[in-house]
Amino acid sequence: AWELTILHTNDVHSRLEQTSEDSSKCVNASRCMGGVARLFTKVQQIRRAEPNVLLLDAGDQYQGTIWFTVYKGAEVAHFMNALRYDAMALGNHEFDNGVEGLIEPLLKEAKFPILSANIKAKGPLASQISGLYLPYKVLPVGDEVVGIVGYTSKETPFLSNPGTNLVFEDEITALQPEVDKLKTLNVNKIIALGHSGFEMDKLIAQKVRGVDVVVGGHSNTFLYTGNPPSKEVPAGKYPFIVTSDDGRKVPVVQAYAFGKYLGYLKIEFDERGNVISSHGNPILLNSSIPEDPSIKADINKWRIKLDNYSTQELGKTIVYLDGSSQSCRFRECNMGNLICDAMINNNLRHTDEMFWNHVSMCILNGGGIRSPIDERNNGTITWENLAAVLPFGGTFDLVQLKGSTLKKAFEHSVHRYGQSTGEFLQVGGIHVVYDLSRKPGDRVVKLDVLCTKCRVPSYDPLKMDEVYKVILPNFLANGGDGFQMIKDELLRHDSGDQDINVVSTYISKMKVIYPAVEGRIKFSTGSH
């Protein structure tokens, strides 16, 4: 028997420095977690203690804090090289700055293979990107070899900016021939490493013949066996065992997100490459693990360039700004309310006496809110805090939509409610009531919107044939998160101001903020 230790991260989202327990900015260092310096300490400790170790990343290193805003991926290549990652799969966010923003800072600088079997380049890009990412890589580990096959969410064109010269194929269809080839070459230990979410990870384990282990990302899934060490609630045991269609037990793992945990999986293979046993757990990277001094010194050196962004106080909050996915993807969250209020405020245009304003409504995908802000830092809100909340460098745009399109959008918001998906809408100038006991597509039981042609704003029922102005992220205007109806049916689209700038301007203007959860979004069961 031969034993392999798989260390894995996913959805680190630019958390190079240690963070608070909720993965926002570190306030109290003694209680902070994660960060590459602490990660390196643990990785090195395991490398010294165990003979056959792989360090893998399942994508979405890009995007999430000021580090990415400023360094644009160069920081990812530098510190992943320093940690000596063995392989990385491309995530959807690796395309946020376009293909060039992936090629130059990361693909050309990484000293480890970057993988995806289901992304195919065409046109002029094919020769430019050739060899810079691979469908698979065979890695020597001790006296054996392990094949790593990569995959990326086929939804990436809807979630990021990969351009028109990359084709995202079905994961299973693309993986099978690569695995077949590895089997032919007698590579008999194969890991699928990728970024398509836990449901697809399980499907790959079930459907792709020859895959021994699946290491995933994208859905920020936390798996744990036993009593979990922090706030995250496990979605299942670690590893999660899937029985494949050909009768094998295939371990599937993921390690939450934001570098808070280091996935730790031990696999025992027989001489034919069959998995005999698998066990492990994510390791919580808390303050009991010291930060590596040399990596920490390097972080501090790179940090200097960021200080202009982080030192300027924009204003204060006297309440916790809840931007957690546990809130913003499930219910009204006060961070969503704050952002929508800022978006409306940024569009105050009193150009007609008949209207108090030309626009009163805001919608915002909950998945676009990427971090909370803790008020226990003297209430200070900085650029860096906002860059973690709104890391995508988007714009808040003005569109004109029919009421019927808005109704479809709100139905889409909850069509698969409960899976922590990003399409759940936060709102401003809208009161919505959902009945989740009804079938998807028929769950919006009340939808009232704030009038504009009025001296005293009040909420009136949405009219299906009326045309409304709405402020929303450009991501939604472009049909992101599945909001195809907005893209297809919008009557006018005017691009707006940078998202962080809109919110920072609002906070600076207000000086002190205290957004509440105030009943904009409600749930009920029964007749109305």
């Epitope: 050739s130 065979v138 054996e144 089997k183 070459l185 590579v187 008999n188 001489e271 034919r272």
Partner: antibody, heavy 117, light 110 residues
């Protein structure tokens, strides 16, 4: 000792047939994929055929496709190459080779096949 | 004619460093790992380098391999008389669905 030993070579007329065998010892035969590679006198190496380990898939060079058949018998720890419709250009030393880590990691000593009238 | 192109011969004096190149295309070297074999006169080939740059156990560290794009190379430093042999590169070809060998390079130690 880990080794591969070929047998079955010899002189055969054009259009004739020959069956090469390769006996493995010193390791678990069934855990590996295998290949046949040939070398014409004074020439370089040419891959002929391969058979995968777990699924028994077979692969052939265009020059032998439809004429040669690779097979294995795990119970006998033996690899075979059935060669039909032999031609003069098939004259070569035939090596049995074990496919290891994405490579040929073990070779037999070879057996000479001469196709001549 | 082999699809993997090697120089037919190479030479060097003892102690010298020699490099043998192997050129292919996207469907072979471009997408797959390269191996190098040594064949001493009258013997079967022997694996030296696998996965582009990994030395097989027992192979002296004078031998090293590298790959870039659609080309690979084998470097032998501190050349010794026992290194006189034929050297072959090999890889899988995705289009042909089979192994490819280079034409071989005869190394002479002067």
């Amino acid at each position: 000792e880990v080794q591969l030993l070929e047998s079955g070579g010899g002189l055969v007329q054009p259009g004739g047939s020959l069956r090469l065998s390769c006996a493995a010892s010193g390791f678990t035969f069934s855990s590996y994929a295998y290949s046949w590679v040939r070398q014409a006198p004074g020439k370089g190496l040419e891959w002929v055929s391969a058979i995968s380990g777990s699924w028994g898939r077979t692969y052939y060079a265009d020059s032998v496709k439809g004429r040669f058949t690779i097979s294995r018998d795990n119970s006998k720890n033996t690899l075979y190459l059935q060669m039909n419709s032999l031609r003069a250009e098939d004259t070569a030393v035939y090596y049995c080779a074990r496919l290891g880590y994405s490579t040929i990691d073990l070779w037999g000593r070879g057996t000479l096949v001469t196709v001549s009238s | 004619q082999s699809v993997l192109t090697q120089p037919p011969s190479a030479s060097g004096t003892p102690g010298q460093r020699v490099t043998i190149s192997c050129s292919g295309s996207l469907s072979n070297i471009g997408r797959n790992d390269v191996n190098w074999y040594q064949q001493l006169p009258g013997t079967a080939p022997k694996l030296l380098i696998y996965l582009n740059n990994q030395r097989l156990g027992g192979v002296p560290d004078r031998f090293s391999g590298s790959k870039s794009g659609t080309s690979a190379s084998l470097a032998i430093s501190g050349l010794q008389s026992e290194d006189e042999a034929d050297y072959y590169c090999a890889t899988w070809d995705d289009s042909l669905k089979g192994w490819l060998f280079g034409g071989g390079t005869k190394l002479t130690v002067l």
